[in-house]
Interface confidence: low
């Protein structure tokens, strides 16, 4: 149980105030984290509050400004990148967002040796992606879907690809679906460890159907946004991987890396690339039916100037109960012998654990085990492996950092974070310097977040990097809600939930209940993290109880729970929310005539289906940017969990799981449907179809659209959205304004 201390005695209560909606919309109680920008084993860069770029040396304790805020301001730079030889800095300005990760920008190169910007052979604009080589100061960049290389910043560029074309061929950057659903990056190029080779992906979207939507803007005529976007079952991008020698790029040109035969026999994806050495690379591939993944280790053949991927270096990962991996297939972390590696995948009991692969996957040595899951491998050194898991005290919504000593026999395991600040910190991530000489720990809660610096050998805390003192002081006179994390055991299923309770919560009274749901495959909502957000306000000021429940399909509790939703999205996720609500009613403090549910994206889909479940449990609910039919969503994501919408595969469940099919069932609930018209991710089409079905069924409902807003509904739309939803809920719960 996690109870946030109220921090005061009753005598002080008259000086305390509840959270207001304005507090939330203004970000009054937002927190800061500190992630060092590591540049060596003992040095890191950080952008100071006054915008100077400062280099810190942990061992000498010295710091100095390498780039002044004056230089940054001279080109309106919002970001920077130091070349590994420390001779140049790129300055990024004119940031222009595209999709979730992608953006374009203007780049200037500043020469630190003479204190001037590099003139001559300036970079074109806007650039889609730019990065330094890992050694020296070579530059690779993507401009108009083609890749260019500079040996030095002032040199003329060498053009590597020539076939790049908007919305057709993408070189070195992903198309929409690879960016959002596979790579989760804005880039698709990778330097070898010493910068000898550059690997890149080419995505051919020529045959992909295009989603088109209006962007209204301010002009007389709206413009049309066209995105090659493969929906479930549609034609997918065709991917190829190339590698070029950057020392002599014109010598043989880009060489294609062969696709494993068992993958190439049908539609497939490329999922990630990991360099092992300058002349060894590891590629991961995935069948379109995403239950088979192949990891292929390829070697450079000097004599032929080609890349060879022997079958003996192909490692197959297959799931017989669901899809391969968790949300993504995990990536390998190679050991110092440059052939064996560590990787997280399901063990025989169906829990994701770290395995060590030396020759074949069948002979893998299991490194961690138990009825919990290893979540991320941060770093492998010669003698230690650092990873995160949710093992400690059997709370799946926690994250602690562990060290396994692999240099000694038998290997010993130590929890680095479990007892550091036990009440305040139960959810950590980490960032390691070269060779793990030092590391930063970033604690996200449940108390106020704190970032600290540690010695990589002894784990001793060296200093606090950020402790959010201002936030702590600002919260001293705020009546925060109480939070508890507990579990329900129902029919051999464990349902973890987080309940957010009003500050003066009294179990003998009755409270309106709001369920906040996401519920997507491999997600987790019940986490021991700090947040002061909209639902905190609803509990603090409006006296609501808010609950979040992790049901079937959610992550980090084993494959049985995770893969329960395989090929049947929209069934068990909804059932488990309903089951939890019934259990909450049994607790005695919920007013069963005032229960609502709300969610965004996948959560909008689940909330819509829950409202249309015909149970009579919910008085009202909100769906923000919901999926309404899996036929409308992206192939890579949808097919991972649902298979194909064909008669000989899973078309029947695609049809049965739509929100539209349940239009009649909305008759007895108050439904608020919200969507941005320029949503590139979950297309406005989804809500348009719900609205049409409700109109055709003559069912009353409320709706709000946000013109030219995407899936995030950002800026002023955010304020409008939360104000609108607050009014809707207060009306539903008969709370006075």
């Amino acid at each position: 149980i996690v109870l946030r201390p109220s921090r005061v005695h009753n005598s002080e209560e008259n000086t305390m105030r509840a959270l207001t909606l304005k507090d939330i919309l203004n970000g009054t109680f937002s927190y800061k984290t500190f992630f060092p920008n590591w540049i060596s084993g003992q040095e890191y860069l950080h952008q100071s509050a006054d915008n100077n770029i400062v280099l810190y040396n942990i061992e000498t304790g010295q710091s100095y400004t390498i780039l002044s805020n004056r230089t940054m301001k001279s080109v309106n730079a919002s970001n920077y990148g130091l070349s590994p030889d420390r001779q140049f800095v790129y300055l990024e300005s004119d940031y222009s967002k595209l999709w979730r990760y992608s953006y374009t920008a203007t780049y200037y190169i500043y020469d630190l040796s003479n204190g001037e910007f590099v003139r001559g052979n300036e970079l074109p604009r806007p650039i889609q992606y730019l990065c330094w080589s890992p050694v020296g100061s070579k530059l690779a960049y993507v401009y108009q879907n083609n890749i260019y290389l500079k040996q030095r910043p002032g040199d003329p560029p060498f053009q590597i690809t020539f076939n790049g074309r908007e919305n057709k061929i993408f070189n070195g950057i992903p198309d929409w679906v690879y960016e959002e659903e596979m790579l989760a990056t804005k880039y698709a190029l990778w330097w070898s460890p010493n910068g000898k080779f550059l690997a890149y992906a080419e995505f051919n979207d020529t045959d992909i159907p295009v989603i088109a939507y209006s962007y209204y803007g301010d002009e007389q005529y709206p413009r049309t946004i066209n995105i090659p976007y493969p929906k479930a079952g549609a034609k997918n991008p065709v991917v190829r991987i190339f590698i070029i020698d950057t020392t002599y790029p014109a010598y043989v040109g880009p060489q294609e890396v062969p696709v494993p035969a068992m993958i190439a026999s049908s539609d497939y994806y490329f999922s990630w690339l990991t360099w092992v050495t300058d002349e060894r690379v590891c590629l991961q591939w995935l069948k379109r039916v995403q239950n088979v993944s192949v990891l292929s280790i390829c070697d450079f053949r000097e004599d032929w100037q080609t890349w060879d991927c022997p079958k003996t270096q192909e490692h197959i990962e297959e799931s017989r109960t669901g899809w391969a991996g968790g949300f993504f297939v995990s990536t390998p972390v190679f050991s110092y012998d440059a052939i064996s590696y560590y990787k997280i995948f399901s063990d025989k009991d169906g829990y994701k654990h770290i395995h060590y692969i030396k020759d074949t996957v069948e002979n893998a040595i299991q490194i961690t085990s138990g009825k919990w899951e290893a979540i991320n491998i941060f770093r492998v050194t010669q003698d230690s492996l650092f990873y995160s898991s949710n093992e400690f005290e059997e709370y799946p919504g926690r994250r602690n950092i562990y060290r396994i000593s692999i240099g000694s026999y038998p290997p010993s395991k130590k929890c680095v974070t479990c007892h550091l600040r036990k009440e305040r910190c139960q959810y950590y991530t980490a960032s390691f310097s070269d060779y793990a000489k030092y590391y930063a720990l970033v604690c996200y809660g449940p108390g106020i977040p704190i970032s600290t610096l540690h010695d990589g050998r002894t784990d001793q805390e060296i200093k606090i990097l950020e402790e959010n003192k201002e936030l702590e002081n600002a919260l001293k006179n705020i009546q925060l809600p109480k939070e508890e994390i507990k579990k329900l055991e129902v029919d051999e299923i464990t349902l973890w939930y987080k309940m957010i309770l009003p500050p003066q919560f009294d179990r003998s009274k009755k409270y309106p209940l709001l369920i906040q749901v996401y519920g997507g495959p491999c997600s987790q909502s019940v986490r021991s993290v700090f947040a002061v957000n909209w639902i905190s306000y609803l509990a603090s000021k409006e006296g609501m109880v808010i609950a979040l429940v992790d049901g079937r399909g959610t992550a980090f509790q084993g494959d049985k729970l995770l893969y329960a939703v395989y090929r049947k999205l929209g069934v068990y996720e909804v059932e488990d929310q309903i089951t939890a609500v019934r259990k909450f009613i049994e607790m005695g403090f919920i007013d069963e005539k005032r229960i609502a549910i709300w969610g965004w994206s996948y959560g909008g889909y689940v909330s819509s289906l829950a409202l249309a479940s015909g149970t009579g449990l919910f008085k009202c609910g909100i769906a923000v940017a919901p999926v309404s039919s899996w036929e409308y969503y992206a192939s890579v994501y949808t097919e991972r969990f649902m298979g194909l919408p064909t008669k000989d595969d899973n078309l029947e469940h695609y049809k049965n799981s739509t929100v539209m099919a349940r239009a009649e069932y909305f008759r007895n609930v108050d439904y608020l449907l919200i969507h941005g018209t320029a949503d590139d991710n979950v297309h406005f089409q989804n809500s348009a179809q719900i609205a049409k079905a409700l109109v055709n069924a003559q069912v009353d409902f409320q709706a709000m659209w946000y013109s030219d807003q995407n899936h995030g509904l950002s800026g002023l739309s955010t304020n409008h959205l939360y104000t609108h939803m607050t009014h809707f809920l207060k009306q539903c719960f008969s709370l006075s304004d």
Epitope: P209, G233, T646, Q685
Partner: nanobody, 118 residues
Framework: EVQLVESGGGLVQPGGSLRLSCAAS????????MGWFRQAPGKGRELVAA????????YYPDSVEGRFTISRDNAKRMVYLQMNSLRAEDTAVYYC???????????WGQGTQVTVSS
């Protein structure tokens, strides 16, 4: 019985135009994605235009983009292919097709011949 019937083919000079029509019966055409394919002698079947159920999304390969336009009238259960600036290499039998998802076309018409020649 699902039926697709094409019409509008014929002989046309290079640079000329033709409008092909496809009448659908036996199913609710708005349910399906519709496409126009062509097959030249000795060659495989090639998709030249596709349109989503509502007509909101269309697709053309590079070879016809800007010259061909696909449209549909769900009320009349018709799909059209407007072909402008025709070239000799556009000579083929043109087929109308319907499918339950993109690129899975399970219903086909008998085809209509288009010949571009001077």
């Amino acid at each position: 019985e699902v039926q697709l019937v094409e019409s509008g083919g014929g002989l046309v000079q290079p640079g000329g135009s033709l409008r092909l029509s496809c009448a659908a019966s036996g199913f609710i055409s708005s349910y399906y994605y519709m496409g126009w394919f062509r097959q030249a002698p000795g060659k495989g079947r090639e998709l030249v235009a596709a349109i989503s159920r509502t007509g909101g999304s269309t697709y053309y390969p590079d070879s016809v983009e800007g010259r061909f336009t696909i449209s549909r009238d769900n009320a009349k259960r018709m799909v059209y292919l407007q072909m402008n600036s025709l070239r000799a290499e556009d000579t083929a039998v043109y087929y109308c097709a319907a499918g339950d998802i993109n690129y899975h076309y399970n219903y086909w018409g008998q085809g209509t011949q288009v010949t571009v020649s001077s």
